[in-house]
Interface confidence: medium
């Protein structure tokens, strides 16, 4: 009797930013819930949290230094991650907990999403490129 989560198997962050959508087999309307995104096979790093309460505005925060935002759909939460580094390429797992009304619900562990961060070219193109080869 757990919530099922669907995630994209892989996303590429070309501009050091990515939208990761977590789709749930559960309608979050008029529920108090905590949706979170976790980094690593062991889910050791909590990247971002979206806290939803039907009587208040959505709260989005990261305690681990990630630049994140979140959007809520009836059966989904989308995490928008910015300023990602190449070395943050990893597998990311969506987690959902419905705290109220009881009973407490959480999800079966999903398959996760591999986010491949392709860094921007930090070296500017030369103003005067050398002669092109024939």
């Amino acid at each position: 009797n757990k919530i099922l989560v669907k995630q994209s198997p892989m996303l590429v962050a070309y501009d050091n930013a990515v939208n990761l959508s977590c789709k749930y087999s559960y309608n979050l309307f008029s529920r108090e819930f905590r949706a979170s995104l976790h980094k690593g096979l062991d889910s050791a790093v909590e990247v971002c949290v979206v806290y939803g309460n039907y009587s208040q505005q959505l709260q989005v925060y990261s305690k681990t230094g990630f630049n994140c935002d979140g959007k809520l759909g009836n059966e989904s939460v989308t995490f928008y991650l910015q300023n990602l580094y190449v070395n943050q390429t990893d597998i990311y797992f969506c987690k959902i907990e419905v705290m109220y009304p009881p009973p407490y619900l959480d999800n079966e562990k999903s398959n996760g999403t591999i986010i491949h961060v392709k860094g921007k070219h930090l070296c500017p193109s030369p103003l005067f490129p050398g002669p092109s080869k024939p």
Partner: nanobody, 119 residues
């Protein structure tokens, strides 16, 4: 074996205080939410307070807001209900229940502890 054991009930005068304890064994309270539910004759069962210890989420019934405080000590695997400014209408049997998701609602119940508020 999973068990929830309540204690701390008793007879108290109106305006008095009691602290109920709910000791859990066989599971970790960090993995669930714990609620205090009361049952009184002729009244509907009421979920008075609720806590999710993993991130400190709490919620209270309007009838007890500002008077009751729910807390949890995960190192002791125990939840507490501090009851202040008690009233006659708080008289009931208080149960703690594990609110982990199951098909049938509450997964586990304690045996209950009786609170009587009377002068």
């Amino acid at each position: 074996e999973v068990q929830l054991v309540e204690s701390g009930g008793g007879l108290v005068q109106p305006g008095g205080s009691l602290r109920l304890s709910c000791a859990a064994s066989g599971f970790n309270i960090k993995d669930t939410c714990i609620g205090w539910v009361r049952r009184a004759p002729g009244k509907e069962e009421e979920l008075v307070a609720y806590i999710c210890p993993s991130h400190g989420y709490t919620r209270y019934a309007d009838s007890v807001k500002g008077r009751f405080t729910i807390s949890a000590d995960t190192s002791k695997n125990t939840a507490y209900l501090q009851m202040n400014s008690l009233r006659a209408e708080d008289t009931a049997v208080y149960y703690c229940a594990d609110h982990k998701n199951t098909q049938w609602g509450y997964a586990y119940w304690g045996q209950g502890t009786t609170v009587t508020v009377s002068s």
